[in-house]
């Protein structure tokens, strides 16, 4: 465990996912990720981020919403929603029933 180079401040975050080894984790930022896999209910995971900060800037879609924040336990009470699916455009020849 060599001495690591100095880096930005750490934050402590709520950890709620199958990967958590404890009730909190420590990282560069806190995350909440809401994911909906095909045919399943959306699942919300809370944890820590250290890599790929660009994911924090992604726009919500109907399948994933990625939220990041930078203060202690800031991800604890955050609830996310997915982008509403676009209603299918009406097909010609249908009678709307």
């Amino acid at each position: 465990d060599p001495v690591k180079p100095s880096r930005g401040p750490l934050v402590t975050c709520t950890c709620e996912s199958p990967h958590c080894k404890g009730p909190t984790c420590r990282g560069a930022w806190c995350t909440v990720v809401l994911v909906r896999e095909e045919g399943r209910h959306p699942q919300e995971h809370r944890g820590c981020g250290n890599l790929h900060r660009e994911l924090c800037r992604g726009r919500p879609t109907e399948f994933v919403n990625h939220y990041c924040c930078d203060s202690h336990l800031c991800n604890h009470n955050v609830s996310l929603v997915l982008e509403a699916t676009q209603p299918p455009s009406e097909q010609p020849g249908t009678d709307g029933q």
Epitope: P9, P23, R26
Partner: antibody, heavy 120, light 107 residues
């Protein structure tokens, strides 16, 4: 290599004070939470106190609350335990431990311990 | 406070034996459990965290399992250096609490 070395133990009379130190080396001290755990002679392990990596939060066992104070100096890579109003039941080996950088409260490295004897 | 109860408090085993130690929490702690080994006159050594994840450098003869309230530590083939006292510890919530220990002795 990663090392924690406790010091400051000794024999002290009931009601008196003592300050323990834990010198850290070989890792980035300011990235880890730190802990004191004690072990009375012939007994099991007892958690005493915890402090966040930045010193912003501190936690204590009920048995020492109001008498012991945990602190740290990240510029000196040192953890402290100020023990006041000592009692015979505080007699124990005191260990410092650090947690994993990613997982708070998960101990991975321990010091060798320092003995505190409270006796008149 | 969460009470941690280990069993047995001591056991005798021979080199090569498979040894299992159990730890029970007084309430659910998910998988937030650690195991430590301590030899006489020495500091504890961290073995397992997250109920089943091995600490760096710990040999694979040690394994952990369980979730919720019931946990086990298994040593697949006991070696002379494994005779020691083993402690479980929960870190689901403060105060952090340890089990009373299991002393593994030579038969």
């Amino acid at each position: 290599q990663v090392q924690l070395v406790e010091s400051g133990g000794g024999v002290v009379q009931p009601g008196r004070s003592l300050r323990l130190s834990c010198a850290a080396s070989g890792f980035t001290f300011s990235s880890h939470g730190m802990y004191w755990v004690r072990q009375a002679p012939g007994k099991g392990l007892e958690w005493v106190a915890a402090i966040w990596y930045d010193g912003s939060n501190k936690y204590y066992a009920d048995s020492v609350k109001g008498r012991f104070t945990i602190s740290r100096d990240n510029s000196k890579n040192t953890l402290y335990l100020q023990m006041n109003s000592l009692r015979a039941e505080d007699t124990a080996v005191y260990y410092c431990a650090r947690d994993q950088e990613q997982w708070p409260d998960v101990f991975d490295i321990w010091g060798q311990g320092t003995m505190v004897t409270v006796s008149s | 406070d969460i009470q941690m109860t280990q069993s047995p408090s001591s056991l005798s085993a021979s080199v090569g034996d498979r040894v299992t130690i159990t730890c029970r929490a007084s309430q659910g702690i998910r998988n937030y459990l650690a195991w430590f080994q301590q030899k006489p006159g020495k500091a504890p050594k961290s073995l397992i965290y997250g109920a089943s994840s091995l600490q760096s450098g710990v040999p694979s003869k040690f394994s952990g399992s369980g979730s919720g309230t019931d946990f086990t530590l298994t040593i697949s083939s006991l070696q002379p250096e494994d005779f020691a006292t083993y402690y479980c510890q929960q870190y689901n919530s403060y105060p952090l609490t340890f089990g009373g220990g299991t002393k593994v002795e030579i038969k």
